[in-house]
């Protein structure tokens, strides 16, 4: 939860804000609820839809070192173990990522296994 100083009324200065909850589906426009003492507030917010990507904020992994280069594929791989997931994110326990062996080629890592729904 985020804590913010908001000058609203004389009694409340520190509001505690809950998560942004989309009004429909999993992302897009929604509301965030704040509390301060007995007071509550709802404000508009937006959950970006790009969090569905394998390496979004939903699933955080701790990675091993890169393995040796596989000559047959020209790639090297490493494994990641789940470190933290957003509460409702159905993240894989482990993922494997690959990248080209040559350090000259700048390429985004690709997940062979990522977040998946049951």
């Amino acid at each position: 939860k985020k804590k913010e100083k908001v000058k609203k009324g004389s009694e409340c200065s520190e509001w505690t804000w809950g998560p942004c909850t989309p009004s429909s589906k999993d992302c897009g426009m929604g509301f965030r609820e704040g509390t301060c003492g007995a007071q509550t507030q709802r404000v508009h917010c937006k959950v970006p839809c790009n969090w569905k990507k394998e390496f979004g904020a939903d699933c955080k992994y701790k990675f091993e070192s890169w393995g040796a280069c596989d000559g047959s594929t020209g790639t090297k791989a490493r494994q990641g173990t789940l470190k933290k997931a957003r509460y409702n994110a159905q993240c894989q326990e482990t993922i494997r990522v690959t990248k080209p062996c040559t350090s000259k080629t700048k390429s985004k890592t690709k997940a062979k296994k990522g977040k998946g729904k049951d």
């Epitope: 939860k1 809950g18 909850t21 609820e33 173990t81 789940l82 933290k84 993240c91 894989q92 049951d118």
Partner: antibody
Framework: QVQLVQSGGGLVQPGGSLRLSCAAS????????MNWVRQAPGQGLEWIGM????????ILNQKFKDKATLTVDISKNTAYLQMNSLRAEDTAVYYC??????????WGQGTLVTVSS | EIVLTQSPATLSLSPGERANLSCRAS??????LHWYQQKPHQAPRLLIK???QSISGIPARFSGSGPGTDFNLTISSVEPEDFAVYYC?????????FGGGTKLEIK
């Protein structure tokens, strides 16, 4: 599979404090949210809050903001619930549960806290 | 906070009958609704997660529907060991909240 073993419950005087423990074994303790839930005798379930062992991020039910403190000790694979200023209405069975959206959850056996003079 | 209202409070059935338990949320919670079974002196046991997702080890006679505000837990053919209290829980926003429970009892 995760096994959760709880301890620390018992009889406490009104106004007193108690620290409940939830020791995890099995799969990685540090990867999953740890919830604390209580159940008063003959009543329903009430969520106290949760903590993530990887970084101690804590989300607390506002009802318990002056009553409960959640902590973890990664080295011991243990989560703790500290309850302060206890009153008769805090008498309940307290449960911890480890939550993964992917595989579901695992619960401790529960520990009874009785607040009485 | 999101209020979950379960109905009926008590459901009396005979083994072999179909059970329909309802959980209504005070606002839309997408599919972030879970069902638990609790027997006396035991911890709750997760039956269904995210409205309709099955849980390993839970018999196939348990199924759930959603999403939105109206959710149902169905037991296709009640077995003697199913008589217990059933709770719904939402994880759409904090605080997490539970319904008041439905007691499934033997008729």
């Amino acid at each position: 599979q995760v096994q959760l073993v709880q301890s620390g419950g018992g009889l406490v005087q009104p106004g007193g404090s108690l620290r409940l423990s939830c020791a995890a074994s099995g799969q990685s303790f540090s990867s999953y949210w740890m919830n604390w839930v209580r159940q008063a005798p003959g009543q329903g379930l009430e969520w106290i809050g949760m903590i993530h062992p990887s970084d101690s991020e804590t989300i607390l039910n506002q009802k318990f903001k002056d009553k409960a403190t959640l902590t973890v000790d990664i080295s011991k694979n243990t989560a703790y619930l500290q309850m302060n200023s206890l009153r008769a209405e805090d008498t309940a069975v307290y449960y911890c549960s480890s939550w993964s959206a992917k595989r579901g959850d695992f619960w401790g056996q529960g520990t009874l806290v009785t607040v009485s003079s | 906070e999101i209020v979950l209202t379960q109905s009926p409070a008590t459901l009396s059935l005979s083994p072999g009958e179909r059970a329909n338990l309802s959980c209504r949320a005070s606002e839309s919670i997408s599919n972030n609704l879970h069902w638990y079974q609790q027997k006396p002196h035991q911890a709750p046991r997760l039956l269904i997660k995210y409205a309709s997702q099955s849980i390993s080890g839970i018999p196939a006679r348990f199924s759930g529907s959603g999403p939105g505000t109206d959710f149902n837990l169905t037991i296709s053919s009640v077995e003697p060991e199913d008589f217990a209290v059933y709770y719904c829980q939402q994880s759409n926003s904090w605080p997490l909240t539970f319904g008041g429970g439905t007691k499934l009892e033997i008729k």
